[in-house]
Interface confidence: low
């Protein structure tokens, strides 16, 4: 807390200029009108001040709005938005995508900071979901973004918002949260043939059920080993071995190199070793000949 | 407009047969999975049997397996339900509803039942 | 066979309230997970797919989330026609198996 002083005669701030670097944080504090650096908050960030002498301008802004700052005044925030606690932010109400970029430039190059987690959070939250054009932004700025939030937050994405997702953005997600997002990638991509379709649903694949599996199997795909290593081990399971084959295309001999790995290991366990042989890779640990085979599996493919 | 309508309920003794068939319009019946679902009196929703697109993929519930037959005739547009050695407890309403269908080489059951028939209403009683 | 259990099996409300109805599977369906509201003498009519999905038509006040094993089906401000019976229906696994459903009655 900043003592209250009076202001030095001829010391009273007439505008937010340079000139208030050489100010001493009492002086910021008596002679700059907390209503005049609400209106000319853009200039604040164009001015070298110190972190104490920000603490100062703070002080007087949640002194003047101690229900919250209005969007006006936290667009222009700038590197002041550094000195908001998260429990500043929850009061907030920002509902332009253009506040949300502004204040992620101030951060951009670090982490994501508690502050910059509750600002999307409110901001999220006073939309009602995660469209595409705040998704673009966001991931813009946070590849990782997508994959922080939990799979709850993720029922909230509307399909139409998946456009916006790239391969990277998914690098970190884990199985529950592509349960979440396959689906939608699934109604978002819905209109598109063949290829084109594949190329997009790749990097959802993680979430997909067997029975889609088996569908892209007869399209020719010819999925990449990297993108079969991050398929769901009990949606592999029950793929045939002429369904796998079908499904790598020419990537099918690199099973080999990843046959001691989930979910090839688990894959091959399920398998009958004649019909591994047919693939004449070498690949071991199938079910030998004249051994029952229970079908443990409850799907049927139904398209 | 599309459309479900069943037909060929009726009041049947048990051990007896049935078939009920369901007429679709509006829509390219031969590329969607279809279903058929069943409400008893007062009580809950049960599915009962599903077939692809293609006739050879069919499934059924634990309940009605070995008794009941579902098949389609993509040339009449219809789904039928053979019901045989029929039982009290297979006194319901009988619904036929169609899969969502909603991207490419879809396996359709996964996404919900969005066009269902009026039902047609089975009784077995002796 | 996945068993599924919804939570009221029936409850009361008033025009304008925002009511929770929740779904609870035995094991992991994913997100494949839907909603329906059925009236007396009806057929069911799908509100909410995969979870989250919004059925084309289906009023903005109905809403869905959840994923693994936990669901909820929400209506933000209850409609005078929105007094039905609301089902859960799981279409991960075969065979597919409903909830018993929740009775939502005027107050």
């Known amino acids: 807390e900043v003592e209250k002083t009076a202001c030095p005669s001829g010391k009273k701030a007439r505008e937010i200029d340079e000139s208030l670097i050489f100010y001493k944080k009492w002086e910021l504090e008596a002679c700059v009108d907390a209503a005049l650096l609400a209106t000319q908050m853009d200039r604040v960030n164009a001015i070298p001040f110190t972190y104490e002498q920000l603490d100062v301008l703070k002080h007087k802004l949640d002194e003047l709005y101690p229900q919250g700052y209005p969007e006006s005044v936290i667009q222009h925030l700038g590197y002041l938005f550094l000195k908001m606690s998260p429990e500043d932010i929850r009061k907030w109400n920002v509902t332009s995508l253009e506040t949300l970029k502004a204040l992620l430039e101030v951060n951009k190059g670090h982490e994501m900071s508690p502050q910059v987690a509750t600002l999307i959070d409110r901001f999220v939250k006073g939309r009602g979901q995660l469209d595409k054009d705040t998704l673009d932004t966001l991931t813009a700025f946070y590849p990782g973004y997508l994959c922080s939030l939990s799979p709850e937050e993720l029922s909230s994405v509307p399909p139409s918002s998946i456009w916006a997702v790239r391969p990277q953005d998914l690098d970190t997600c884990d199985p529950r949260q592509l349960d979440v997002l396959y689906p939608k990638a699934r109604l978002a991509f819905q209109n598109m043939n063949g290829s084109e379709y594949f190329v997009k649903i790749q990097s959802f694949l993680g979430g997909a059920p067997t029975e889609d599996l088996k569908a892209l199997s007869q399209q020719n795909v010819s999925m990449d080993l990297a993108t079969f290593m991050k398929l769901r081990t009990d949606a592999v399971l029950p793929l045939t071995v002429a369904e796998v084959q079908k499904l790598l295309g020419p990537h099918v001999e690199g099973l080999k190199a990843e046959e001691r790995h989930r979910p090839v290991r688990d894959w091959i366990l399920r398998q009958r070793q004649d019909d591994l042989d047919t693939l004449g890779l070498g690949l071991q640990g199938g079910i030998p000949n004249g051994y029952l085979v229970l079908d443990l599996s409850m799907q049927e493919a139904l398209s | 407009q599309v459309q479900l309508v069943e037909s060929g309920g009726g009041v049947v003794q048990p051990g007896r047969s049935l078939r009920l068939s369901c007429a679709a319009s509006?829509?390219?019946?031969?590329?969607?999975?279809m279903h058929w679902v069943r409400q008893a009196p007062g009580k809950c929703l049960e599915w009962v049997a599903v077939?692809?697109?293609?006739?050879?993929?069919?499934n059924y519930a634990e309940s009605v397996k070995g008794r009941f037959t579902i098949s389609r005739d993509n040339s009449k547009n219809t789904l039928y339900l053979q019901m045989n050695s029929l039982r009290a407890e297979d006194t319901a309403v009988y619904y036929c509803a169609s899969a969502l269908r909603i991207a490419v080489a879809a396996s359709y059951y996964y996404y919900g039942l969005d066009v269902w028939g009026q039902g047609t209403t089975v009784t077995v009683s002796s | 066979e996945i068993q599924m259990t919804q939570s009221p099996s029936s409850l009361s409300a008033s025009v304008g309230d925002r009511v929770t109805i929740t779904c609870r599977a035995s094991?992991?369906?994913?997100?494949?997970l839907n909603w329906y509201q059925q009236k007396p003498g009806k057929a069911p009519k799908l509100l909410i797919f995969?979870?989250?999905s919004l059925q084309s038509g289906v009023p903005s006040r109905f809403s869905g989330s959840g994923s693994g094993t936990d669901f909820t089906l929400t209506i933000s401000s209850l409609q005078p026609e929105d007094f039905a019976t609301y089902y859960c229906?799981?279409?991960?696994?075969?065979?597919?198996?409903f909830g018993c459903g929740t009775r939502l009655e005027i107050k």
């Open positions: 229906q799981q279409s991960y696994e075969m065979p597919i198996t």
């Open positions: 077939i692809g697109s293609r006739e050879s993929n069919k």
């Open positions: 094991q992991s369906v994913r997100s494949f």
């Open positions: 509006g829509f390219t019946f031969s590329s969607y999975g």
């Open positions: 995969t979870a989250s």
